[in-house]
């Protein structure tokens, strides 16, 4: 039982670290293997993860690793029964892959203007929470040249867009991820999409 | 306006159980963690526990962490603080309190006063 | 856990003068990624519920008067009130939130 791609972490910096890993052959992960992970801090507890299969010989782990602080580093071994099969530390703050955003929505807004709106998925007690920015992807659902990338990176997770730069009677769906730059985090999951009818009307139309 | 009102309260012998409440309004309920802290009487403030309401996620104070058990009914908007084997020395107001849009305890109840005595 | 100590403990002010109230840390509460400090300072007046002064070490709440200010980093962090007025009367907290939350013992503030 060999291990061909090392585990490769994230933490959501809440709740929740993830590792995943391939071995170099089918393997039933939740049977074979077990994922042990140690706050390297004097006294605490030693904890297991089973894996469960992502492909045939893909194996993912989620650990519950919550009030991540900076200077938190885990010791993780992964074991096949009594054989020790790799061993390496984790350091949530180095490795954040933030919660996706939530409940992306789009209302219409004064002076033909649609407003997008979405939740910040940390509470205001998280460290991340006041550190995150977006990308929002809007594109046209029947044409797919016809796309835009707005980059958010003031506090509010709002986006206002003028219709006027949409297609009139086209229906556009958007979705929206994010990031931590301090944190150098990797992106999010994109969000769900939320779609919509464009029924701008050029002015000079009326 | 946020609003968070507790209630619960009594005198209650050394051994015994209670159940405090607080209702939240003025604010979608999932929104925010939400959490108790506790005064003795003329003594200061201590943090006990709090809840996720969204995902019922819970962590605590471990001084508290075997006799008191935090929870919420999302329906209803309420937290509960459920403290069992109760010692004179839990006598002291029970707050909840929650983060505003920005860092900190921005919101609290008025507090409910629970007394252990024999 | 994270020690909070606060000194003094009563403070005795007439009004008009500065008072300063000081708050460490038995660790660091900065975070070097955000460059922020997870304090936070409260004041309590008599039979009431504590209340938000300043976050983030140096941040005053919205309504607070600017005679109020934060500063300090790491672990040494302190309160100022530039012209105490009798309505200053209270006790001071200083509190942590950069891992779980802890309170410093209060500070008791007397307008003389």
């Known amino acids: 039982v060999k291990v061909l791609h090392e585990p490769s972490c994230f933490s959501d910096y809440i709740s929740t670290s993830v590792c995943q890993w391939k071995m170099d052959h089918p393997t039933n992960c939740s049977a074979e293997l077990r994922l042990s992970y140690q706050l390297d801090f004097m006294g605490s507890e030693n904890h297991t993860c089973v894996p469960e299969n992502r492909e045939d010989s893909v194996c993912v782990c989620s650990m519950p690793i919550d009030d991540a602080v900076e200077a938190d580093v885990y010791q993780l071994d992964l074991w096949a029964g009594q054989q020790l099969l790799w061993s390496g530390s984790f350091q949530p703050s180095k490795h954040v892959k933030p919660r996706t955003p939530g409940n992306l929505t789009v209302y219409p807004n004064i002076s033909h203007t649609w407003l997008l709106m979405w939740t910040n998925p940390y509470p205001t007690e998280n460290h991340l929470h006041s550190e995150l920015t977006y990308m929002v992807n809007v594109s046209n659902d029947n044409d797919p040249e016809d796309f835009k990338v707005y980059n958010v990176t003031y506090m509010g997770p709002t986006l206002r867009l003028a219709a006027s730069t949409l297609k009139s009677g086209a229906s556009y769906s958007a979705r929206v991820r994010a990031w931590a730059q301090t944190y150098n985090s990797t992106w999010s999951d994109w969000s769900p999409s939320t779609t919509w009818l464009n029924y701008y009307e050029p002015w000079e139309q009326h | 306006e946020v609003q968070l009102v507790e209630s619960g309260g009594d005198l209650v012998k050394p051994g015994g159980s209670l159940r405090l409440s607080c209702v939240a309004s003025?604010?979608?309920?999932?929104?925010?963690?939400i959490h108790w802290v506790r005064q003795a009487p003329g003594k200061g403030l201590q943090w006990v526990a709090r809840?996720?309401?969204?995902?019922?996620?819970?962590k605590y104070n471990e001084k508290f962490k075997s006799r008191f058990t935090i929870s919420r009914d999302n329906a209803k908007n309420t937290l509960y603080l459920q403290m069992n084997s109760l010692r004179a020395e839990d006598t002291a107001v029970y707050y909840c309190?929650?983060?505003?849009?920005?860092?900190?305890?921005?919101?609290w109840g008025q507090g409910t006063l629970v007394t252990v005595s024999s | 856990d994270i020690v909070m100590t606060q000194t003094p403990l009563s403070l005795s002010v007439s009004p008009g003068e500065p008072a300063s109230i000081s708050c460490k840390s038995s660790q660091s509460l900065l975070n070097s990624r955000t460059r922020k400090n997870y304090l936070a300072w409260f004041r309590q007046k008599p039979g009431q519920s504590p209340q938000r002064l300043i976050y983030?070490?140096?941040t005053r709440e919205s309504g607070v008067p600017d005679r109020f200010s934060g500063s300090g980093s790491g672990t040494d962090f302190t309160l100022r009130i530039s012209r105490v007025e009798a309505d200053d009367a209270g006790v001071y907290y200083c509190k942590q939130s950069y891992n779980l939350y802890t309170f410093g013992q209060g500070t008791k503030v007397e307008i003389k």
């Open positions: 309190t929650r983060f505003g849009s920005t860092y900190g305890f921005a919101y």
């Open positions: 809840i996720d309401p969204n995902s019922g996620g819970t």
């Open positions: 983030w070490a140096s």
């Open positions: 003025g604010y979608t309920f999932t929104n925010y963690w």
